[in-house]
C-alpha cells in the first residue's frame, strides 16, 4: 500500500531572467527512493538516480542545475517557462509518487517573493 505523500512548493512565481528552485519532499513512507525525475509536460528535464547521480537532459543543460538535494534549479527564466512542473519519485516497494508545481514567470518586478525555496 502506498502511504507516502509529496509536499511541494506549490504555486510559485519568479521574475524573467531570474532563477527558481523547484523542490519536492516525500514523507510518510519508509520506501526507498531509487530515482527522481523532473519533468515539464512531455519533456524530461533531469533525472536524479540514487546510485548514479544527476543527468540533465541536453536540451536544458545550459540553464538547469541539479539540487539542492533532490530539487532542481531553473536559471535564466523566460516567460515560456511558465507552466506545470512535476517531480516523479520512483520508489521501492511503493512505486511512483508524483508532485506538481506551477511556475509563473513574470515580465515585471512584481513577482511574489514569499514562496519557500525561492532564490532572490
Amino acid at each position: 500500500m502506498m502511504t507516502g505523500t509529496i509536499e511541494t512548493t506549490g504555486n510559485i512565481s519568479a521574475e524573467k531572467g531570474g532563477s527558481i528552485i523547484l523542490q519536492c519532499h516525500l514523507s510518510s513512507t519508509t520506501a526507498q527512493v531509487t530515482q527522481v525525475n523532473w519533468e515539464q509536460q512531455d519533456q524530461l528535464l533531469a533525472i536524479c538516480n540514487a546510485d548514479l547521480g544527476w543527468h540533465i537532459s541536453p536540451s536544458f543543460k545550459d540553464r538547469v542545475a541539479p539540487g539542492p538535494g533532490l530539487g532542481l534549479t531553473l536559471q535564466s527564466l523566460t516567460v515560456n517557462d511558465t507552466g506545470e512542473y512535476f517531480c516523479i519519485y520512483h520508489t521501492y516497494p511503493d512505486g511512483t509518487y508524483t508532485g506538481r508545481i506551477f511556475l509563473e514567470v513574470l515580465e515585471s518586478s512584481v513577482a511574489e517573493h514569499g514562496a519557500r525555496f525561492q532564490i532572490p
Partner: antibody, heavy 120, light 107 residues
Framework: EVQLQESGPGLVKPSETLSLTCAVS????????WNWIRQPPGKGLEWIGY???????YYNPSLKSRVTISRDTSKNQFSLKLSSVTAADTAVYYC??????????????WGQGTTVTVSS | DIVMTQSPDSLAVSLGERATINCKAS??????VAWYQQKPGQSPKLMIY???YRYTGVPDRFSGSGSGTDFTLTISSLQAEDVAVYYC?????????FGGGTKVEIK
C-alpha cells in the same frame, strides 16, 4: 579510450554458476556505471544490472535473486555471477560502461561480448 | 517493466533511400530513449540518446525524434555500411529495457 574485455568459461552446466569478468582499461571503474547486458541467440538485448562508481549495485528484478555484480578496484575490473543457470541463460554477455551524467541510461562503451552456453 | 515495441521487424530499403524505424513505449518515457546499431558479429554502438541527440561521431544522416510513447529513428539516405539491427532503449526508469530490434537490409 575506454576498452572493456570480457572473460570467463564459454560452457556452463545447468544448475551451476556462471562467472564472468570484465577488464577495463583507459578509465577508472571508480567513475561512472559498469553494466552487464546479455543477448540470447537471435534475440534482443536484456539489461542485467550495474555496479556504480561508489560500489552500489542494481539488478534487473527478473534476475535479481540469481545475480551478483562485484568489483576489484585494484585490478580495475568488475564481475558477474549468475547462479542456478538453465538453457535460457545461454547468450552473448556484454560488459558496458554508462556515463549517466552525460547520456543518462544510454550505454556508450561496450565490450566485444563473450558467448556462454548452458549445456550438460 | 516498460515494454519497448519496435516496428517493423525488418526493413529493405534501396541505397540512397530513406529508412524509418519506429519504437513504441508501453508508458510515457518522455525523451529518455536511446538508439543503438548492431552490425553482424559486433557489439551494439550508441547512435542517439535523449531521443534526438546524435552521439559523438555518428553521421548526420541518422536522426531521432519523438517524445512520450512514440519514437522514430530515420536514416535519410541509406548507405551499404548501415546494414545492421537497430535497437531502441528506454532509460526513464529502471529496469532499463530494449526493443526487440529492427533489421535493416538493402533492397
Amino acid at each position: 579510450e575506454v576498452q572493456l574485455q570480457e572473460s570467463g568459461p564459454g560452457l556452463v552446466k545447468p544448475s551451476e554458476t556462471l562467472s564472468l569478468t570484465c577488464a577495463v582499461s583507459g578509465y577508472s571503474i571508480t567513475s561512472d556505471s559498469w553494466n552487464w547486458i546479455r543477448q540470447p541467440p537471435g534475440k534482443g538485448l536484456e539489461w542485467i544490472g550495474y555496479i556504480s562508481y561508489s560500489g552500489n549495485t542494481y539488478y534487473n528484478p527478473s534476475l535479481k535473486s540469481r545475480v551478483t555484480i562485484s568489483r576489484d578496484t585494484s585490478k580495475n575490473q568488475f564481475s558477474l555471477k549468475l547462479s542456478s543457470v538453465t538453457a535460457a541463460d545461454t547468450a552473448v554477455y556484454y560488459c558496458a560502461r554508462l556515463d549517466f551524467s552525460n547520456y543518462g541510461g544510454a550505454v556508450d562503451y561496450w565490450g566485444q561480448g563473450t558467448t556462454v552456453t548452458v549445456s550438460s | 517493466d516498460i515494454v519497448m515495441t519496435q516496428s517493423p521487424d525488418s526493413l529493405a530499403v534501396s541505397l540512397g533511400e530513406r529508412a524509418t524505424i519506429n519504437c513504441k513505449a508501453s508508458q510515457n518515457v518522455r525523451t529518455a530513449v536511446a538508439w543503438y546499431q548492431q552490425k553482424p558479429g559486433q557489439s551494439p554502438k550508441l547512435m542517439i540518446y535523449s531521443a534526438s541527440y546524435r552521439y559523438t561521431g555518428v553521421p548526420d544522416r541518422f536522426s531521432g525524434s519523438g517524445s512520450g510513447t512514440d519514437f522514430t529513428l530515420t536514416i535519410s539516405s541509406l548507405q551499404a555500411e548501415d546494414v545492421a539491427v537497430y535497437y531502441c532503449q528506454q532509460y526513464y526508469t529502471t529496469p532499463w529495457t530494449f526493443g526487440g530490434g529492427t533489421k535493416v537490409e538493402i533492397k
